[in-house]
């Protein structure tokens, strides 16, 4: 079954390469576990960036993923990628699972374009 | 009478601040007096950014302009805008004139989104 | 190895209360959704119950909600059914099991251990 | 709650027979769906979970198939041990529901 995921269109990440933005599903379950997954489009290709389990005692995730963090409450994730270059420009898609309990929905969001530009090395310091 | 006028739809100011693109117009015609303004929108509100005449003579603008500069080469303006911050991030409408001989045409392209991060300041070398 | 073994069934009037108990070996207990399934005499096997890794969700059959009580003790890796209220229709072979690992990234449980079951007898 | 229909209710068979029981759902469940083996006096034991993956250490010669309403357990060579009570269960949903069972005997 779906669920409908909603997430920015455009987001700049900072100048330190840090992109933030919400992904948010509805309507709102009443659910233990909820599985997302952060993917990135190119072309006609997705390719996994990140995914982690949300559930009732763990509200944090991406533990296992060094450029990925996450928060979790309610039906809103927070979610926040790190450490992005000019190349990783590109669409970003939401993926919501809810896992449990059954029925199992699912949903995608249409994508979030972020936009990374380099920053220019600082001068040396003599 | 209208033309076409192309742009794209978004640019990504460099960390220094500049944005380049081009703004096109046809069908081509055989022009001695090309008009391109530059023009930023804000809600329901026109601003403009900057203006300059080319002629078969002067095929480099906006000189009055600190902020502006460009190029043009037939049917084609190559548009710089710098000094951009990220406040000026928005949406930026290329506007063309044919301004002689007659008949006068003029059109409006769809504007090209410009994003601007701030740069993080380089640390105080000691 | 990872085992289940109930406890508490017995001879009960109808109207009485019960407390089975099952306590899990051999794997992280609060790692796991626990449920209670039933089988009537030469019957087949009806769910009962179920309850989250943590105690916070409990779920329940239309026939058994606002009369059985599941909850669990990690500490102690005890699952419980509190059982009130039984009607003769409760007789059955109580058996937990342990269902679907948390935070497992695909949807989809099965029960793959077992207890041994425990005979719920309801009866005047 | 979603109704699992099994057939036949109960079936005779010699050695090495193949032995086929299906499973019909009143409604659309995907492949969640599990068979267990359940031997006189035993508690229940899984088979098959997402309706063809091989629980791990069950023989090869058990295997399901199937999506949507109608799902197939298959036992390709029935041996003596194999004697039992087959069951289905649907998890699409809350309360998960069993088929009625189908008992396997030897001729």
């Known amino acids: 079954e779906a669920i409908q995921v909603t997430q920015p269109s455009v987001v700049l990440a900072s100048s330190h390469g840090v992109a933030s933005f919400p992904c948010e599903y509805s309507p709102s379950h009443n659910t233990d576990e909820v599985r997302v997954t952060v993917l990135r489009q190119t072309n006609d290709q997705m390719t996994e960036v990140c995914a982690t389990t949300f559930t009732e005692k763990n509200t944090v995730g991406f533990l296992d993923y060094p450029f990925c963090s996450g928060t979790f409450n309610e039906s809103r994730v927070n979610l926040t990628i790190q450490g992005l270059r000019a190349v990783d420009t590109g669409l970003y898609l939401c993926k919501v699972e809810l896992m449990y309990p059954p029925p199992y929905f699912v949903g995608m969001g249409n994508g979030t374009q972020i936009y990374v530009i380099d920053p220019e090395p600082c001068p040396d310091s003599d | 009478e209208a033309i076409q006028v192309t742009q794209p739809s978004v640019v990504l100011a460099s960390s220094h601040g500049v944005a380049s693109f081009p703004c096109e117009y046809s069908p081509s015609h055989n022009t001695d007096e090309v008009r391109v303004t530059v023009l930023r929108q804000t809600n329901d509100q026109m601003t403009e950014v900057c203006a300059t005449t080319f002629t078969e003579k002067n095929t480099v603008g906006f000189l009055d302009y600190p902020f502006c500069s460009g190029t043009f080469n037939e049917s084609r303006v190559n548009l710089t805008i710098q000094g951009l911050r990220a406040v000026d991030t928005g949406l930026y409408l290329c506007k063309v004139e044919l301004m002689y001989p007659p008949p006068y045409f003029v059109g409006m392209g769809n504007g090209t989104q410009i994003y601007v991060i701030d740069p993080e300041p380089c640390p105080d070398s000691d | 190895e990872v085992q289940l073994v109930e406890s508490g069934g017995g001879l009960v009037q109808p109207g009485g209360s019960l407390r089975l108990s099952c306590v899990a070996s051999?794997?992280?207990?609060?790692?796991?959704?626990m449920h209670w399934v039933r089988q009537a005499p030469g019957k087949g096997l009806e769910w009962v119950s179920a309850?989250?890794?943590?105690?916070?969700?409990?779920y329940y059959a239309d026939s058994v909600k606002g009369r059985f009580t599941i909850s669990r003790d990690n500490s102690k890796n005890t699952l419980y059914l509190q059982m009130n209220s039984l009607r003769a229709e409760d007789t059955a072979v109580y058996y937990c099991a342990r269902g679907r690992q948390v935070g497992k990234s695909s949807f989809g449980e099965a029960f793959d251990v077992w207890g041994q079951g425990t005979l719920v007898t309801v009866s005047s | 709650d979603i109704q699992m229909t099994q057939s036949p209710s109960s079936l005779s068979a010699s050695v090495g027979d193949r032995v086929t029981i299906t499973c019909q759902a009143s409604?659309?469940?995907?492949?969640?769906l599990n068979w267990y083996q359940q031997k006189p006096g035993k508690a229940p034991k899984l088979l098959i979970y997402?309706?063809?993956n091989l629980e791990t250490g069950v023989p090869s010669r058990f295997s399901g198939s199937g999506s949507g309403t109608d799902f197939t357990f298959t036992i390709s060579s029935l041996q003596p041990e194999d004697i039992a009570t087959y069951y289905c269960q649907q998890f699409t949903s809350f309360p998960y529901t069993f088929g009625q069972g189908t008992k396997v005997e030897i001729k």
């Open positions: 309850i989250s890794g943590s105690g916070g969700s409990t």
């Open positions: 997402d309706a063809s």
């Open positions: 051999g794997f992280t207990f609060s790692s796991y959704y």
């Open positions: 409604q659309d469940i995907s492949n969640y």
